[in-house]
């Protein structure tokens, strides 16, 4: 016997209770796949999470995060606060970077600023809590008659950068 | 069916007190976290307070040593008592799921009650 579910569209389910007849998702459900024996419920955007796309009868709500938040995860399945640039959000809140680290962005972690010294070069500007350190020449470049030729002064052991 | 009822909002005067309620139904209350957030009037809406299912508290710089949060798992609830209250505390406050577990960090899966609004005012 020909499986009659198999000819049941997205948009529908295949209703056993009244002869595998094709029945149109109920509200607030959706198929988005053709021989469906159930419809999905359509995924709610609520508290923290406002809608980007409404449900439909064949495709799920999609989910933003409201001002102040953004997303994470697959299909934005998390919401998490934003900080300030120059800080991070940890157990207890948004928190400063500490000395020596930075956040560009209103999410992420404080990263530590480049060790200009590791690849030969000085620092041109310093660091802040919301931006990294600007590499300018190597000291070498700087002196007075120097070439191009001229090699990368050898590199300072880590921690003794002037930063 | 999950559902989150807060009630305890009112007017109350700068320096009064206040003690929120959430009553939670249709989920396991005693092992699952719980949250509180507020929106402030044409604010955002801001983690304010979280607890553990094993009591572990967390609270938002802005509210620490002035506001507690509580559980009676044989009761269902959770409660947020609020001291020292200040104009700026004004808005509505709402109890929240908190499956995440991080601060500031809310689920698809989680659920939120109405709201019951705090007017803080002489």
């Known amino acids: 016997l020909q499986d009659l579910c198999s000819n049941c569209p997205a948009g529908t389910f295949c209703d056993n209770n009244r002869s595998q007849i094709c029945s149109p998702c109920p509200p607030n459900s959706f198929s988005s796949a053709g021989g469906q024996r159930t419809c999905d419920i359509c995924r709610q955007c609520k508290g923290v999470f406002k809608t980007r796309k409404e449900c439909s009868s064949t495709s799920n709500a999609e989910c933003d995060c409201i001002s102040g938040y953004h997303c994470l995860g697959a299909e934005c399945s998390m919401c998490e606060q934003d900080c300030k640039q120059g800080q991070e959000l940890t157990k207890k809140g948004c928190k400063d970077c500490c000395f020596g680290t930075f956040n560009d962005q209103k999410r992420g972690i404080c990263r530590p600023w480049t060790n200009c010294s590791l690849d030969g070069k000085s620092v041109l500007v310093n660091g802040t809590k919301e931006r990294d350190v600007v590499c300018g020449p190597s000291p070498a470049d700087l002196s007075p008659g120097a070439s191009s030729a001229t090699p990368p002064a050898p590199a300072r052991e880590p921690g003794h950068s002037p930063q | 069916e999950v559902q989150l009822l807060e009630s305890g909002g009112g007017l109350v005067q700068p320096g009064g007190s206040l003690r929120l309620s959430c009553a939670a139904s249709?989920?396991?209350?005693?092992?699952?976290?719980m949250s509180w957030a507020r929106q402030a009037p044409g604010k955002g809406l801001e983690w304010v307070s979280g607890?553990?299912?094993?009591?572990?508290?967390y609270y938002t710089e802005s509210v620490k040593d002035r506001f507690t949060i509580s559980r009676d798992n044989s009761k269902n609830t959770v409660y947020l008592q609020m001291n020292s209250l200040k104009p700026e505390d004004t808005a509505v406050y709402y109890c929240?799921?908190?499956?995440?577990?991080?601060?500031?960090?809310?689920?698809?899966?989680?659920?939120w009650g109405q709201g019951t609004l705090v007017t803080v005012s002489s």
């Open positions: 929240a799921t908190w499956g995440t577990l991080r601060f500031g960090v809310w689920a698809e899966y989680d659920h």
């Open positions: 249709g989920f396991t209350f005693s092992s699952s976290a």
């Open positions: 607890i553990y299912s094993g009591g572990s508290t």
